[in-house]
Amino acid sequence: SIPWNLERIIPAWHQTEEDRSPDGSSQVEVYLLDTSIQGAHREIEGRVTITDFNSVPEEDGTRFHRQASKCDSHGTHLAGVVSGRDAGVAKGTSLHSLRVLNCQGKGTVSGTLIGLEFIRKSQLIQPSGPLVVLLPLAGGYSRILNAACRHLARTGVVLVAAAGNFRDDACLYSPASAPEVITVGATNAQDQPVTLGTLGTNFGRCVDLFAPGKDIIGASSDCSTCFMSQSGTSQAAAHVAGIVARMLSREPTLTLAELRQRLIHFSTKDVINMAWFPEDQQVLTPNLVATLPPSTHETGGQLLCRTVWSAHSGPTRTATATARCAPEEELLSCSSFSRSGRRRGDWIEAIGGQQVCKALNAFGGEGVYAVARCCLVPRANCSIHNTPAARAGLETHVHCHQKDHVLTGCSFHWEVEDLSVRRQPALRSRRQPGQCVGHQAASVYASCCHAPGLECKIKEHGISGPSEQVTVACEAGWTLTGCNVLPGASLTLGAYSVDNLCVARVHDTARADRTSGEATVAAAICCRSRPSAKASWVQ
Amino acid sequence: QDEDGDYEELMLALPSQEDGLADEAAHVATATFRRCSKEAWRLPGTYIVVLMEETQRLQIEQTAHRLQTRAARRGYVIKVLHIFYDLFPGFLVKMSSDLLGLALKLPHVEYIEEDSFVFAQ
């Protein structure tokens, strides 16, 4: 009788498997920044090191009574979820606990920073195998806490954080909002978002994925063999920390970018009922529940991509939104989305040596999002080709002219503010393979990449009748790298990728005044990586 | 994820009337003061002074010492609780909020963040 949460995240073929690194030893170490813990609990004894680190504020209230088992409750439970003998995700993993939360579960940003610095110092003094840091805590947005997470992540440490239990946008909290952290929301046994009293799991673009976080069985500090159930995004983050530890145990050289991409790729998709989230957050929140991925040896050199949303640009006339990929990832395409439809498009530009995806708001618009498609493409060489806007009534074409470069994405940016110009049907010639065809008065940007065995193709789907959205999916074995609304459509809200599905959204009011011949077309660029093959464009 | 969230950023580049010293007057603060948007979670009186990324070890200590010296001239006692070397250059300080304007004008300071609570989730 295995607890529901372990059944959910560990596929049947993994249940009895012991994850070991190639040399036979499991050298992954998990650092837990939480309350004190009961190291003598049978679930974790012998695999937990209680460091002498202690940086906590005093408990509130004059009548506060410190009871050891209560002080240890949160941390002991999480330690058990990560590496407990019976109810743990990564049963053999070594754990180090740092006390940054007091007996009431309160800590400070400064105490957490000192804890992170302690880990960095330990790493410098005695370099070891892969390190995973579990941050089952949240405070208000903190630039310095996010920066510290960034610095630690760049030393090769994998940080996993709770999204927060405030039923709010995770981007308003730290460390959940740090891009270098794997941020985890909580779901229940029915794969639905966790409700906690009047609140519940956080959501939004800063959440990477969800994991079990309701009624989770784990070590109880009440006695050395006791169990209890606890709920929260801490428990969800502990599951992912355990999964990451198991992944690193098998393959110690996996990087943060690879771990995140694989977690996303192999998660269970589309089981969460998105109606639980506020309407404006539904499109931004990933519909992903974590599961333990197979090893890279079992799955070959798949092309892995994820969608990264920017912050909302805000409503000012020249407001821009910027979406960034992780340093190791390639930005293969850039699109934009606006709820009002008033946007001036999107483009890719280099900032400080890194390609970023930008989107521009239009006059009267409520703001835009930039949507980046970030991929792991080994040995890739990517570049952007752009063409200025053509005269009204004409199309702009851009293609990848370098040898062995394939088109992975298209972006369109309108110089004019007048949206009506873009509502006239464009003169659409037969599309040539591997090229971007611009809307009228649009600058066109083509994202072109060369990588061993990379091949791409365009897949289009058009709908003439009234429809709020048009979708097109890449078939099995192919990965969506680019997603656009093609010229000829009515006023569109934009396009974005949801896993392997390209979604083109149309303005509600546009449905009524669309002429019968005018179709909204979603265009997906689908790519795959076949290491033995040459880079090619597939027609 | 990297844009600032619901966050208070205040420019405290206030020309101090009592700053008679040449080196203090010469340095105009471009650094910002930040604090948690949720008032109940703030910890006024404790501040994380974050220095520019390239700041050297010795400069971190000198900056902290300089803040203590200048505060003492104004009759304030400052307690440096911790110096950060390994993850980012900076220091944690217990001081009156009256000294924020002064601290923001110190060389090498990128921003100052008021300490705040974090909670078990």
Epitope: A87, S224, F227, M228 | -
Partner: antibody
Framework: EVQLLESGGGLVQPGGSLRLSCKAS????????INWVRQAPGKGLEWIGR????????RYNEKFKGKATISRDNSKNTLYLQMNSLRAEDTAVYYC???????????WGQGTLVTVSS | EIVLTQSPATLSLSPGERATITCRAS??????LNWYQQKPGQAPRLLIY???NRATGIPARFSGSGSGTDFTLTISSLEPEDFAVYYC??????????FGGGTKVEIK
């Protein structure tokens, strides 16, 4: 050889009290917790409480709080169970048992019978 | 509070037969469950600890299995001295120690 030897049982009047002893030998006394368990005639096992001889810390079954008191004398390697306000339903064989590191009761005393009757 | 339910209450078997006793916990207890044997007029004796580990001096015919909430004690071939009462036990928070109601294995 590890041994636990109980004594102090016998006939007690209802409302009376008694003190049972458990003499330990053959191991480091302060290292292991000692539990008191009772068994009414023809019934199952019922846990009363435990003591950690190292620090004197005690833990009781809620049912016995106020009725049972467990103590120890480290100089004599002896544990005690004081029972007050005894009633007929307290008639049972009382055992002391050592809890090992794995939290199982690896050694038991032979038991001592307490009969509460007028 | 965890409740341990043992079944059957009585098991009537002949020597040489296989005995199977189950213990079901009302909550998850991992593998931290112990089994004891008690003969008439004697103190209980530890047989199995942590669900499946035989205590010192316990014959190989005794084995334990299970984890989570469902546990089994198996005596592969009953010897005359095995006819006794068997108890399962776990630790909990309140009360800290819980015993099952017992299973009597008697000669058929």
């Amino acid at each position: 050889e590890v041994q636990l030897l109980e004594s102090g049982g016998g006939l007690v009047q209802p409302g009376g009290s008694l003190r049972l002893s458990c003499k330990a030998s053959g191991y480091t006394f302060s290292r292991y917790g000692i539990n008191w368990v009772r068994q009414a005639p023809g019934k199952g096992l019922e846990w009363i409480g435990r003591i950690d001889p190292g620090n004197g810390g005690t833990r009781y079954n809620e049912k016995f709080k106020g009725k049972a008191t467990i103590s120890r004398d480290n100089s004599k390697n002896t544990l005690y169970l004081q029972m007050n306000s005894l009633r007929a339903e307290d008639t049972a064989v009382y055992y002391c048992a050592r809890a090992n590191d794995g939290y199982s009761f690896d050694y038991w005393g032979q038991g001592t019978l307490v009969t509460v009757s007028s | 509070e965890i409740v341990l339910t043992q079944s059957p209450a009585t098991l009537s078997l002949s020597p040489g037969e296989r005995a199977t006793i189950t213990c079901r916990a009302s909550q998850y207890v991992g593998s931290y469950l112990n089994w004891y044997q008690q003969k008439p007029g004697q103190a209980p004796r530890l047989l199995i600890y942590d669900a499946s580990n035989r205590a010192t001096g316990i014959p190989a015919r005794f084995s334990g299995s299970g984890s989570g909430t469902d546990f089994t004690l198996t005596i592969s071939s009953l010897e005359p001295e095995d006819f006794a009462v068997y108890y399962c036990q776990v630790w909990d928070s309140s009360p800290p120690v819980v015993f099952g109601g017992g299973t009597k294995v008697e000669i058929k």
